[in-house]
Interface confidence: low
């Protein structure tokens, strides 16, 4: 899903108050709801039927520093019988995220916000049949 | 996929640095790759064999202020007749995002990360039968 | 989140029945499998029961299934276990979870993201 342009409202003062100072603002350090986390079902890239494969960045000046992509293995969809049927398409499922960037000159550090496209799994589709004139 | 805990390195200064006044971080206006965008074939919410719907949840003090959140529609898959064969499961497919919470009294205003679980979509799988003894 | 309350557990007779009942709150409820698990003293939590979303799929561990029935109510929001037939080894706290998926492995613990308190079933002889 899509991120929409940051504008130049979001991290704006409001208008009667004086403008934040050389284009930088105050990040707070933690993070809010640290420990939630992801509780999918296991192994689902591997008993889809549109299966994937995840490969891993990494990055020491980003945060997350890892950032796991996935890749559908197969161009159809994997039937009952575990044969590849191509009347059917795996296709991948993205999401636009934020990540941190790290920029730093000496003691000086600052960070900024990243937009990442991330691959997050693939899935099962008919596809859709264009009939060429 | 987990995003993981931030610790104590990530956001510091390097050792030899003065320590951050104030627990807070400069935080550069603008977002790297802002244009970026998905290009995800398109309906593929509906033409899925495992469909889902959309939600949007909408907070004007975080950014993205629109999060979008899938639900599968089917507790089975859809087979090619279009009805649902329950010894296949629809399960959602999960990632950790971050988006900025913006807080602010009067003029004062800072920015903190959240961490937020989005539910991008939903693929068909093979349960795992489990016999229970 | 999802907060979770059960209730109607107490001192029963063996051979008699008591009816559990799990109050959600909290996110919507319909979005979620629900479970039963119970854990005796010095013992680890075991599955006892689950649901699916539907309500049309059920599950339960060997040694309740035929006097114990899982069921759901979506529109009072709560979840129940039917005890039967207990005996003095169903003696246990009893707690009830909530899935954020389902994927049909019911009974594996780590995939139940949201807990009860738990509510004290003991079964004399």
């Known amino acids: 899903r899509k991120i929409p342009k940051v504008g130049h409202t979001f991290f704006q003062k409001p208008e009667s108050c004086p403008p934040v100072p050389g284009g930088s603002m105050k990040l707070d350090i933690g993070i809010i709801n640290e420990n939630q986390r992801v509780s999918m079902s296991r192994n689902i890239e591997s008993r889809s039927t549109s299966p994937w494969n995840y490969t891993v960045t990494w990055d020491p000046n980003r945060y997350p520093s890892e950032v796991v992509q996935a890749q559908c293995r197969n161009l159809g969809c994997i039937n009952a019988q575990g044969k590849e049927d191509i009347s059917m398409n795996s296709v991948p499922i993205q999401q636009e995220t934020l990540v941190v960037r790290r920029k730093h000159q000496g003691c000086s550090v600052s960070f900024q916000l990243e937009k990442v496209l991330v691959t997050v799994g693939c899935t099962c589709v008919t596809p859709v049949i264009h009939h060429v004139q | 996929r987990k995003i993981p805990k931030v610790g104590h390195t990530f956001f510091q200064k390097p050792e030899s640095c003065p320590p951050v006044p104030g627990g807070s971080m400069k935080l550069d206006i603008g977002i790297i790759n802002e244009n970026q965008r998905v290009s995800m074939s398109r309906n593929i919410e509906s033409r899925s064999t495992s469909p889902w719907n959309y939600t949007v949840t909408w907070d004007p003090n975080r950014y993205p202020s629109e999060v979008v959140q899938a639900q599968c529609r089917n507790l089975g898959c859809i087979n090619a007749q279009g009805k649902e064969d329950i010894s296949m499961n629809s399960v959602p497919i999960q990632q950790e995002t971050l988006v900025v919470r913006r807080k602010h009294q009067g003029c004062s205003v800072s920015f903190q990360l959240e961490k937020v679980l989005v539910t991008v979509g939903c693929t068909c799988v093979t349960p795992v039968i489990h016999h229970v003894q | 989140e999802v907060q979770l309350v059960e209730s109607g557990g107490r001192l029963v007779q063996a051979g008699g029945s008591l009816r559990l009942p799990c109050a959600a709150s909290?996110?919507?409820?319909?979005?979620?499998?629900m479970g039963w698990f119970r854990q005796a003293p010095g013992k680890e939590r075991e599955f006892v029961a689950a649901?699916?979303?539907?309500?049309?799929?059920?599950a339960y561990a060997d040694f309740v299934r035929g006097r114990f029935t899982i069921s759901r109510d979506d529109a009072r929001n709560t979840v129940y276990l039917h005890m039967t037939s207990l005996k003095p080894e169903d003696t246990a706290v009893y707690y009830c979870?909530?899935?954020?998926?389902?994927?049909?492995?019911?009974?594996?613990?780590?995939?139940?993201?949201?807990w009860g308190q738990g509510t004290q079933v003991t079964v004399s002889s």
């Open positions: 909290g996110r919507t409820f319909t979005s979620y499998p």
């Open positions: 979870a909530a899935r954020t998926s389902y994927d049909g492995t019911y009974d594996y613990i780590d995939d139940y993201s949201y």
């Open positions: 649901i699916s979303m539907s309500g049309d799929d059920a």
